[in-house]
Every structure is written in C-alpha cells, then in structure tokens.
C-alpha cells in the first residue's frame, strides 16, 4: 500500500460546502490576505504536524497487522518480501530495524516514553481543538505502543 | 486510482488574472491537505500554496504572497489557485499535488496546466 | 528555506550499472523526535508530473522497484539506482518536507 493508502476518515474533518467564489471564508481570507496578517508562519504549521502524522502513519501501518496474520503464510512463501503494504515496505528496508532499536534503546521493551511524550506534548497544544481528540483516541487504543510490541514480539524485522 | 486534472491555463498579459482548477478524483478529497507547485520552463520545481483538507490552514510561497489564493471546495471535489498581478515570472506549468499522510510531502500530481505571462 | 543543492547536475551511466545521485540540504532535515529524516525522491520523465519515490529519505513508495534505495541523514542524502534500466531516464529531484517545500535544482539522467 502507498502512503495515500490510509483509512481517510482519521484525518477527516468537517468543511464548509459553500461555493468559493461566495464563500465567506474566502472573503475573510481576502481581507486577512490584504491586511497582510493571513500569512502566519507555515514552518510552525509542520512543527505541530510532524508528530501527529508520525503517529498516523504507525497507525496506518498497524491497520495493516490483521492483513499481515492472515496472510502469514504467503508472506513465509515469499521470503524476500513481495508485499506493497506499508508494514512490508517499511519492513524490507533498514528503517525498521532502525527504529526499532531506537525505540528499545536502553529501556524495558515495553516502556515507550517518546510516543507519550509526542501525544502529550499534542494534547498541551491542541487542548481545546479535536486534533486532541484524535489524539486520546490514539492513546486509548494505545495503538503505537502496541503495534511496536507486536513487532517486537514476532521477531519480524529477522524474517529478511 | 487518484486522479487529478487540472484546467484554466494559458496565456494572459502581465498584470491580468487567471484562475485555476484541480478536478479530484479516487480518493476522499476533504480528508487531505492540497498543494499548488510550480515548474517554470527548463526550470526546477517550487511550491506555491497549500491549503489543508478543512481550509482552516492556508500558506504561500514569498513569491505568491499577497497575488495567490487558495481555495477549495469539497462538495465538487475541487481545488482553486486564484493569480492577480501575474509577472512574466509566473510563467511556468502549475501542478496541483495531493498531500500524503505525511505533512509537505507530495504522493500524486496532476499532469500540469501551462500558464504564460507575456504582452 | 532550506536550500536543496544536488549533484551532479547531469549523469551518463551505462544499462546495468549503478548510479548515484547526490542531495545535500542547507541545514538538518532529522526530526529528532522519530530519528526520521524529512527528505524525499522523485521522478521526473519527460511530459510528465514527478513521481514519488522514497520518502523518509529511505522508504520507497509502493511499486517503487527495488532498484532504487535512498539513504543519508541530517543534511547529506543519497539516491542510489543499482542497475539502470531504460525506463529510469529522467530527472531526478530531493525535496525536504521538514519546513516549507523546498526541492533540488534537479540532476538530469541520461544512457551512456
């Protein structure tokens, strides 16, 4: 699977449906544009998003786990890694390991400090928006943490 | 498959006005952020605008700024790039570009619309 | 901005061997917080819109074939084909997705 491969609704948000050529947004957006105010600093913007999309994308990539145990044996057929899948693909390369081993670096394997820290940091800056929710939503289920653990536990990064 | 088709190039005198259109298609448009990017002729790439899949986030390049729009709307599945006080500098193919999950980085592209600046 | 300046600007290399395109980048693009680094491949064919190729500067994109390998980290990247084929004449571009877009000027490959 490719990176637009992801299930869509988790980044999905409400929008207006207005026309843009009578979209007050877009009016709004004229005024700010012109007043010289609109244009606040897009390199912040990605600060904010980087962790969030990394989260997303160990979610993405764990989506996938239930296709992966099903097809446990045609992945043993094809040992040098024939899948497109995000988890195959981040699996064929050095990444995984790499990763991996950063995670565990001097901790127990189940503690995971850094991806708490990443929500947490989220959740301080988005408190009020439903970026937070997302967020505790990723917490609840614990999905990074436990998709490294099953990638831990399976040994999977030694399948190569 | 993804699939974007971008419309309303071509050519227009310098100070003049043109606005472009991305039509998407094969995939839920209002869940990703979107891009304009630029090629001039025999030129390199440069990133003109992005607006995320909510319109609440909206940025341009220094060199659009205060000329360029951004727009969309989600029910037609379609992206805008609104350009006043065009310079012969605009000159160049202007790609529209879907978001990945991955914020700035670019997994599909329409095939281009020429837009050219001159008298 | 972060300024993407590639290397060469255009490379000959014969059907079958290796070759190598560099990519260096003003300042780091390694977001410390995953150890990932923020730069991506892509490819530019003749007529056509660039194509994604790697991401994270050493994940390829699905369907991307296993030719193609990136690697690198914090400023210095690489984009490695192993054994050129016809299909892989193009431009070839590095862009860092860790601030506002940037790409390389672009390196031109060509069969010698």
């Known amino acids: 699977r490719s990176l637009q491969d992801t299930e869509e609704k988790s980044r999905s948000f409400s929008a207006s449906q207005a026309d843009p050529l009578s979209d007050p947004d877009q009016m709004n957006e004229d005024k700010r544009h012109s007043q010289g105010t609109f244009t606040s600093d897009y390199s912040k913007y990605l600060d904010s998003r980087r962790a969030q999309d990394f989260v997303q994308w160990l979610m993405n990539t764990k989506r996938n786990r239930n296709n992966i145990a099903k097809r446990h044996d045609e992945f043993e057929r094809h040992a040098e890694g024939t899948f497109t899948s995000d988890v195959s693909s981040y699996l064929e390369g050095q990444a995984a390991k790499e990763f991996i081993a950063w995670l565990v670096k001097g901790r127990g394997r189940r503690d995971f400090p850094e991806e708490v820290a990443i929500v947490e940091e989220l959740g301080r800056r988005h408190a009020d928006g439903s970026f937070s929710d997302e967020m505790n939503t990723i917490l609840d289920n614990l999905a990074a943490r436990d998709f490294i653990n099953w990638l831990i536990q399976t040994k999977i990064t030694d399948r190569k | 498959q993804v699939q974007l088709v971008e419309s309303g190039g071509g050519v227009v005198q310098p100070g003049r006005s043109l606005r472009l259109s991305c039509a998407a298609s094969?995939?839920?448009?209002?869940?990703?952020?979107m891009h304009w990017v630029r090629q001039a002729p025999v030129k390199g790439l440069e990133w003109v605008a992005f607006i995320s899949n909510d319109k609440s986030n909206k940025y341009y390049a220094d060199s659009v700024k205060g000329r360029f729009t951004i727009s969309r709307d989600n029910s037609k599945n379609t992206l805008y790039l609104q350009m006043n006080s065009l310079t012969a500098e605009d000159t160049a193919v202007y790609y529209c570009?879907?978001?990945?999950?991955?914020?700035?980085?670019?997994?599909?592209w329409g095939q281009g619309t020429l837009v050219t600046v001159s008298s | 901005d972060i300024v993407m300046t590639q290397s060469p600007d255009s490379l000959a290399v014969s059907l079958g061997e290796r070759a190598t395109i560099n990519c260096k980048s003003s300042?780091?693009?390694?977001?410390?917080?995953?150890?990932?680094?923020?730069l991506a491949w892509y490819q530019q064919k003749p007529r056509q819109p660039p194509k994604l190729l790697i991401y994270w500067a050493s994940i390829r994109e699905s369907g991307v074939p296993d030719r193609f390998s990136g690697s690198g980290s914090g400023a210095d990247f690489t984009l490695t084909i192993s054994s050129l084929q016809a299909a892989d004449v193009a431009v070839y571009y590095c862009?860092?997705?860790?601030?506002?877009?940037?790409f390389g000027q672009g390196t031109k490959l060509e069969i010698k």
């Open positions: 570009a879907k978001e990945s999950i991955l914020a700035a980085l670019f997994d599909s």
């Open positions: 862009q860092q997705f860790y601030s506002v877009p940037t």
């Open positions: 300042q780091s693009v390694l977001y410390s917080s995953n150890n990932k680094n923020y």
């Open positions: 094969g995939f839920t448009f209002s869940s990703y952020g």
